[in-house]
């Protein structure tokens, strides 16, 4: 009896694992084995596929074959008993294109109101993703074990910290990887659960802000208790993207070590141009808080996000405000090469009732003013980038009197 060729061959590639599955054509024939050959692009000859010779099952693994994952490959299979079937050719494919991203490895650490998530590629030193290691981003789904209400967090890197959680509560999460450059979305990791700890005696510092004064950065934060000491650390933001590396070498800011106030001042030259993460910790001598939320700090934006400079043209019922580039020391204007929005606050000099205008334009009209009345104006700039949500400090207030009633034209 002639053996029939196997049918419906499927190639599954997850990370560096190459799996072949197929259907027997004739279930009634026993003791049949199966063998594969492969052929690379531009070659005429077929080569035996190691790991997939004389297989008795309908599945084989050819991960040991060192292939160029960007090169097209063709496979063929036949059944063997005393005689052999004809070859069945599988559609040619490129391993990289066909490959799926496997589930990442997840390592969790708990605090009282936060969870630190460390994510690593599922296959260490993967050949498939060797050129894409730094391009991986991850997304996760997290939920309270008791409620099951899911929250999704997109576009995170190999280290991510989730804040504002409840103490002594079990949270569960699953993570998947994505290679957006190749339009690939991976499969989810198994579910990992961790319980946050009892509430810490000392809360972490909050509301950390960086501003610029002269040639210095001023770092400020809020704290619940008095008589504390604080320390501040920084880390290059890009280090969060380093796959497989989970040793984060946070560095002290020398002028912000063991400070007794809720602010510290340090020279701008402490940081080269770049994006950094900053965090603050409190201590009362016996106990230490967990670290604060990490804030993103971009020296480019921070250094140049100075309060706007403006001129006022006074009319009887309005001010025309012309916003110019802020001046550096030396009176040279600062070039702002990112979009800004301006917040303008004005009030009658004799009153505390402030009104606010938000504008993208650099010429702004403040309407509905009373003639011959002194109004004061201050302004600040905000970046329009949500991720780098930065604001300058307010400019000094400028006060002007509106003109008499007939000058509005």
């Amino acid at each position: 009896k002639n053996l029939k060729s196997p049918q419906k061959v499927e190639v599954d590639i997850i990370d560096d694992n190459f799996i072949l599955r197929w259907n027997r054509s004739d279930e009634s024939v026993g003791n049949v084995t199966f063998s594969f050959d492969y052929q690379k692009t531009g070659m005429d000859n077929w080569i035996k596929l190691s790991g997939c010779q004389n297989i008795t099952s309908t599945k084989c693994n050819f991960s040991s074959l060192k292939l160029n994952v960007y090169e097209e490959i063709k496979l063929r299979i036949r059944a063997e008993k005393e005689n052999t079937s004809s070859w069945y050719e599988v559609d040619s494919f490129t391993p990289f294109r066909k490959a799926q991203i496997g589930p990442p490895e997840v390592h969790l650490e708990a605090e009282d109101k936060a969870i630190v998530i460390h994510i690593s590629p599922g296959t260490k030193d993967s050949v498939m993703w060797a050129l894409d290691g730094l391009s991986f981003t991850y997304s996760l789904v997290i939920w309270k074990n008791s409620s099951g209400v899911e929250e999704r967090i997109e576009n995170i890197y190999s280290r991510h910290k989730i804040y504002k959680l409840s103490p002594e509560t079990t949270y569960c999460l699953k993570v998947k990887a994505a290679l957006l450059t190749s339009w690939k979305i991976g499969v989810y990791s198994p579910v990992h659960c961790i319980k946050t700890t009892v509430e810490n005696e000392l809360p972490p510092p909050e509301n950390i802000e960086v501003s610029v004064q002269n040639q210095n950065y001023v770092l400020k934060w809020d704290y619940t208790y008095a008589n504390m000491t604080f320390q501040v650390q920084w880390l290059h933001a890009f280090l969060k993207r380093n796959p497989g590396n989970h040793l984060y070498k946070w560095k002290q800011i020398p002028d912000c070590e063991n400070v007794k106030t809720t602010q510290c001042v340090f020279p701008q030259n402490v940081f080269q141009k770049g994006i950094y993460l900053l965090r603050v910790q409190a201590s009362d001598g016996n106990n230490t808080s967990f670290w604060s939320e990490e804030i993103k700090f971009d020296t480019e934006i921070q250094a140049f996000l100075l309060p706007p400079v403006f001129n006022i043209r006074s009319l009887s019922d309005s001010f025309h405000i012309y916003i110019g580039a802020p001046k550096q020391s030396g009176n040279t204007p600062v070039i702002q090469d990112y979009p800004l929005i301006y917040e303008i606050i004005f009030w009658e000099n004799t009153s505390n009732a402030e009104r606010k205008i938000i504008e993208k334009k650099t010429d702004v009209t403040v309407p509905n003013l009373k003639p011959l009345t002194v109004y004061c104006v201050k302004a600040r700039a905000h970046t329009m980038d949500e991720k780098l949500n930065k604001s300058s400090v307010f400019s000094d207030a400028v006060c002007e009197k509106t003109k008499p009633g007939n000058t509005s034209k």
């Epitope: 390592h107 650490e109 590396n245 989970h246 040793l247």
Partner: antibody, heavy 118, light 107 residues
Framework: QVQLVQSGAEVVKPGASVKLSCKGS????????MHWVKQAPGQGLEWIGR????????KYAPKFQGRATITADTSTSTAYLELSSLRSEDTAVYYC???????????WGQGTLVTVSS | DIQMTQSPSFLSTSVGDRVTVTCKAS??????VVWYQQKPGKSPKVLIY???YRVSGVPSRFSGSGSGTEFTLIISSVQPEDFATYFC?????????FGQGTKLEIK
């Protein structure tokens, strides 16, 4: 494979100094921390301090601050511990350890016995 | 400094027994605790890190749990090669501190 090889045993007089070495292989010392830990005879473990060989930043336990100096030479992948003004209670085995992922001291040297005796 | 109080200091047990070693931190250290095994004349060896993660190659009879201030190392069925001293260590804050050790002896 990762290995940490420490210098040999030392017998020193009270008041003197000693410098111990720890040579790493199988990894890039700059990518890790290098720690030193003390274990007195029949006692527990005491963390002395650590260095980041990449920029020589150090941290010390308050007890050892001032008497211990940790340095590193990245060109030879070696970390050093210098102990000064030695006294009898400094007699101990001193271990170096690599600080790796998640801040874990994941690989340890074989230890160096320092005996302080007149 | 954070104190790590380990108990018991000594533990006499037989092969096949289940053993529990506890460690109490003087303040909340999250899950930043490591467990080591040390045999006489040898260097310490990491068993468990981040409170509950077993190092690859460590037998599954070793497990760790706990968070905040209370941590536990369990050996589900003691084997002859497990007779050694066990230390806990916190890695939440400098200076790193160790428990005083638990010596596991054959009964």
């Amino acid at each position: 494979q990762v290995q940490l090889v420490q210098s040999g045993a030392e017998v020193v007089k009270p008041g003197a100094s000693v410098k111990l070495s720890c040579k790493g292989s199988g990894f890039n010392i700059k990518d890790y921390y290098m720690h030193w830990v003390k274990q007195a005879p029949g006692q527990g473990l005491e963390w002395i301090g650590r260095i980041d060989p990449e920029d020589a930043e150090t941290k010390y336990a308050p007890k050892f601050q001032g008497r211990a100096t940790i340095t590193a030479d990245t060109s030879t992948s070696t970390a050093y511990l210098e102990l000064s003004s030695l006294r009898s209670e400094d007699t101990a085995v001193y271990y170096c350890a690599r600080g790796g992922n998640f801040y874990v001291m994941d690989y340890w040297g074989q230890g160096t016995l320092v005996t302080v005796s007149s | 400094d954070i104190q790590m109080t380990q108990s018991p200091s000594f533990l006499s047990t037989s092969v096949g027994d289940r053993v529990t070693v506890t460690c109490k931190a003087s303040q909340n250290v999250g899950t930043n605790v490591v467990w080591y095994q040390q045999k006489p004349g040898k260097s310490p060896k990491v068993l468990i890190y981040s409170a509950s993660y077993r190092v690859s190659g460590v037998p599954s009879r070793f497990s760790g749990s706990g968070s905040g201030t209370e941590f536990t190392l369990i050996i589900s069925s003691v084997q002859p090669e497990d007779f050694a001293t066990y230390f806990c260590q916190q890695k939440n804050n400098y200076p790193y501190t160790f428990g005083q050790g638990t010596k596991l002896e054959i009964k």
